[in-house]
Interface confidence: low
């Protein structure tokens, strides 16, 4: 039989991944009312929209942005000035340096005369008017507009000791997930910042080798499990008064400040109140604190009365963050997700008491994030539809209608291409644009608020689309399996001939951290897209114990325990997939990055003798080497009397003999200030000290994500080369 | 209640000096920005010079072109008081010296104004 | 700098009469404008902040309006106490502080 001439599809190249030929775009809005918003052109232009006149016009020119090379910018909410963000020099995850040039679109010229500082760690508006508040060299600045010389709020900034508005490493990376650490109030009359007093945490320190003659060694403060935390402080300051009477302190509540303690959110409720979150160390009781603005004591008070606490007494508190309030219209109720008594996370509504919460939504599922509560509806996501854990859908509840009506917004909109949703609404929802993620290619669209009408489709992929009609695209399937009780949701990606006859190399990709998900049902052409496409590859991604979405008791499972049953879990698939029958049982590999690099590790080390090679990238190799808020989270503290013994017993490095049997591949960049290059180091030197032959590659410089362009081809051509000299298949 | 009261006036020569008050109560003076403002006979209003802290006991200066490197702008908190040092003054500088008190900490528009002082230059 | 322009030098009007007050800028001053009354012999005396934010006691007939380069300044019924020079002023781009050259209105 010959191949019918109809089929000229090819099949991925690795080099059309390393290119990101087959990259998607998303359509975010930028709202700045009820029916505007801006959004950047493919050209760099800057331009805004109105939803109901149909207007659109430039605002901003590239020309503009070109000439002080700016790659971001954001609009003054008297529409007056335009910041322009330029010299973008990553730092963290989310933190980043840049310098900043304001724009005045009525002169249509720069701000000239107290021009800002360079380079700026935080920037940002107010959300009224055109007041700036930045953080440069740890200290936080105000100018009431951009012309006037900036008014010094904080003096006590100093590199790796204290940080005013914005968080050090721990804070940013296992607390906020933000660059920043203030908060204006929604009149712009006040701002909340913390102060992070990093002077007593152990140093990380790492060199970084550069060009120079002598590498330099950089220093960061980074509290490892067990050792001493920041000492965090909130502040607010009158930005009309600064200094009047200066940065006023909010307090924290007594049975939070008995013990070591975090901050872990700040919400304005309204321009007088303000919403903290804390938590205790041991992270399974969180306190949410309402304060109130005592002018006549010139202070923030924050009653007894006023304090709502969470507690979990099978696990942590909250999903990976605990979650954060949504306050209705009278300041004073509020929407928030947590466990119910079946240990599903569900909306509730708290008026008085968390004890007297009305639960809102519930059912053997998730509710994900509150998007938006207006003065007649709750929006919100869920994994609700059809019982797909890894599916996000968008529902309105009509709270203004009594009794309350459920509508799923998205659920039957693109039924087969869309089911994993985000949302963006303007400030009171008359408008949003959903933005869908999958499984077919994604789509940004527009909708009315009031009859969720689709208005206008924002971005289709179009020209994704028809350069992916000559690609030979894998298969994608979501399943379930089951084994003794527990339901395992897994993808697998099928190679585009799939014959359920033959056999084919397994590679397993793992990640399995606490309170994260693999399979979820989204588009994405990546590495292993290409695996299956080109080298006949199957891949599948298992959601075992300690994943999210599917209740606390699935999720709580890790707890205290970590690296047990995210590996037992992963073998257990491994089976179930070979008793499919498509699975050569001599070609199956794993392999994982970060937490996926630590359950890569252990189970290549189990002893099962099932895989027969693996890779690693930056693995977490011992819990006692990763952060305090992360690691302490998920197995409390490296003490005697607390956890130590599984501390001790859960390290890659434990198990050394044991990768006697299988190819290890170990990969880390020199630079990783997250999962700190001192772990592969340790398993390297365990693996020496047992005489074990393995694989390894440094990348020099490179931090947890090797994402420099140079080294992210170097790495994946490198694990390419390994798995197929592993599976055998023939370059 | 809030009272700015000049005094320091009277007729010099050209290129005298001159050292303008300014007493300040019923406010907390170190929290607002300070202006002198002046007014020529028979003519409209024209900014001189003001002082505003910038936190930490920093403090700005800012003057109209037309009396920088002659004028000097101070204050003492200590006392509440506002000053205004005019060397080398001109013709030109003849007019009533009014003290004003911004609005706000940052806003440098005026909600309270002395009753001024008379300087007049003339040879 | 930013240079302000009033219109009219001088109104006339008769006392219950509607006055409007112009006051243009060569340049934006977005919303940072000020009005002033000065009655002759006497101190100068805010009457309207941010544009059109009345200052304390100052009587409901006084109202501000516009943004960005022209502004307006509107005493709805005039009262014989109105007759007096009125001054705008920008603080939004500064130094210098500017302010107009000021609007007499006269009794008609």
């Known amino acids: 039989l010959r191949p019918s001439r109809g089929n000229t599809k090819r099949a991925l190249t690795l080099k059309d991944i390393l290119n990101g030929t087959f990259s998607y775009k998303t359509y975010f809005p930028n709202w700045i009312s009820e029916q505007e918003y801006l959004h950047q052109s493919e050209d760099d232009n800057i331009v805004f929209y109105n939803i109901e006149t149909r207007e659109s016009y430039i605002i901003l020119s590239n020309s503009t942005m070109k000439s002080v090379n700016a790659t971001d910018y954001g609009l003054s909410p008297d529409r007056q000035f335009v910041y322009l963000e330029s010299d973008y020099s990553k730092l963290w995850r989310y933190s980043y340096t840049a310098t900043y040039y304001i724009y005045d679109l009525q002169n249509g010229e720069f701000v000239r005369g107290y021009e800002l500082p360079r380079p700026i760690q935080y920037l940002c508006w107010s959300p009224v008017g055109s007041k700036l508040a930045y953080v440069y060299q740890n200290n936080i600045y105000l100018k009431q507009r951009p012309g006037d010389p900036p008014f010094q709020i904080t003096y006590t900034g100093r590199e790796n000791r204290i940080f005013n508005g914005i968080p050090d490493w721990v804070y940013e990376e296992e607390m906020l997930a933000t660059k920043y650490a203030l908060w204006w109030s929604p009149d712009g009359k006040f701002l909340a910042y913390v102060e992070f007093n990093d002077s007593d945490i152990p140093i990380i320190a790492y060199s970084y080798y550069g060009d120079g003659q002598y590498p330099r060694t950089i220093n960061i403060p980074y509290p490892k499990a067990g050792a001493k935390n920041p000492v965090v402080r909130v502040f607010i300051v009158d930005t009309t008064y600064p200094h009047h009477v200066g940065p006023m302190e909010v307090p924290v509540p007594e049975m939070i400040a008995s013990s070591d303690y975090y901050f872990s959110w700040l919400t304005w409720v309204s321009s007088e109140r303000v919403c903290l979150q804390w938590l205790k160390r041991v992270q399974n009781v969180s306190v949410l604190s309402i304060c109130d603005f005592r002018e006549d004591w010139h202070a923030w008070e924050c009653p007894k009365n006023q304090e709502h606490v969470e507690e979990s007494r099978t696990g942590w508190a909250g999903g990976f963050f605990v979650s954060t309030p949504a306050f209705s219209q009278d300041a004073t109720s509020y929407y928030k997700i947590f466990s119910d008594k079946d240990g599903y996370k569900h909306i509730h509504y708290i008026k008085d008491t968390v004890e007297n919460a009305i639960q809102i939504t519930s059912g053997k599922w998730e509710a994900i994030y509150i998007f938006r509560v207006t003065q007649d509806s709750l929006f919100y996501s869920s994994n609700e539809f059809e019982g797909y854990p890894g599916r996000r859908n968008i529902y309105r509840i009509s709270i203004g209608n009594s009794p309350p009506s459920k509508k799923c917004v998205t659920c039957h909109l693109r039924k087969e291409r869309c089911q994993y949703y985000t949302a963006s609404f303007s400030y009171k929802a008359k408008y949003y644009a959903l933005v869908c993620y999958g499984p077919g290619l994604p789509i940004s669209t527009l909708h009315d608020g009031r009859t969720d009408q689709e208005i206008q489709v924002l971005e289709e992929n179009k020209e994704l689309e028809n350069s992916l009609r000559n690609i030979q695209l894998p298969k994608v399937e979501i399943k379930k399996l089951k084994d003794g009780g527990l339901t395992f949701w897994y993808k697998m990606i099928l190679p585009p001939q799939f014959d359920r006859s033959k056999k084919y190399p397994l590679l397993i990709q793992v990640y399995g951290g606490p309170c994260s998900q693999s399979v979820k049902s989204v588009f994405a052409v990546n590495w292993i897209t290409y695996l299956a496409s080109k080298e006949g590859i199957v891949i599948a991604l298992v959601d075992g114990r300690g994943t999210a979405f599917q209740g606390d008791k699935f999720l709580h499972a890790v707890y205290r325990k970590l690296g047990v049953y995210e590996v037992e879990d992963q073998l257990t698939a491994v089976r179930k997939f070979i008793e499919m029958g498509f699975i050569d049982e001599e070609r199956i590999a794993i392999w994982g990055w970060s937490y996926g690099g630590y359950v890569s590790s252990l189970a290549l080390a189990s002893g099962t003798g099932l895989f027969k090679c693996g890779i690693a990238v930056a693995p977490v190799s011992s819990w006692e080497y990763y952060a305090s808020i992360y690691s302490e989270r998920f197995m409390g503290l490296p003490t005697k009397d607390d956890n130590l013994e599984h501390y001790k017993n859960s390290t890659v490095m434990a198990r050394a003999e044991y990768f006697r049997n299988v190819d290890y591949l170990l990969i880390h960049g020199t630079a990783d200030d997250n999962v700190h290059f001192q772990n592969s180091a340790q398993i390297a030197k365990a693996l020496v000290n047992a005489q074990v032959d393995f694989q390894a590659m440094w990348y020099s410089d490179q931090n947890h994500g090797i994402s420099s362009g140079r080294s992210q081809n170097h790495l994946y051509t490198h694990m390419t080369h390994f798995l197929k000299q592993c599976f055998s298949l023939s370059d | 209640d809030v009272q700015l009261v000049e005094s320091g006036g009277g007729v010099v020569r050209p290129g005298e000096s001159l050292r303008l008050s300014c007493a300040a109560s019923g406010f907390i003076f170190r929290n607002y920005a300070m202006t002198w403002v002046r007014q020529a006979p028979g003519e409209g209003l024209e900014w001189v010079s003001t002082i505003r802290s910038s936190g930490s006991g920093r403090t700005d200066t800012y003057y109209a072109d037309s009396v920088k490197g002659r004028f000097t702008i101070s204050r003492d908190s200590s006392n509440n008081t506002l000053y205004l040092q005019m060397n080398s003054l001109r013709a030109e500088d003849t007019a009533v010296y009014y003290c004003a008190k911004s609005g706000t900490f940052w806003d440098t528009f005026f909600d309270y104004w002395g009753l001024g002082t008379l300087v007049t230059v003339s040879s | 700098e930013i240079v302000l322009t009033q219109n009219p030098g001088t109104l006339n009007l008769s006392p219950g009469e509607r006055a409007t007050l112009t006051c243009r800028a060569s340049q934006s001053a977005g919303r940072n404008l000020a009005w002033y009354q000065q009655k002759p012999g006497q101190t100068p005396r805010l009457l309207i902040y941010?544009?059109?934010t009345r200052a304390t006691g100052i009587p409901d007939r006084f109202s501000g309006s516009g943004s960005g380069t022209e502004f307006n300044l509107t005493i709805s019924s005039l009262q014989n106490e109105d007759f007096a020079v009125y001054y705008c002023?920008?603080?939004?781009?500064?130094?210098?502080?500017?302010f107009g050259g000021g609007t007499k209105v006269e009794i008609k």
């Open positions: 941010d544009v059109n």
């Open positions: 002023q920008q603080y939004n781009n500064w130094p210098p502080l500017t």
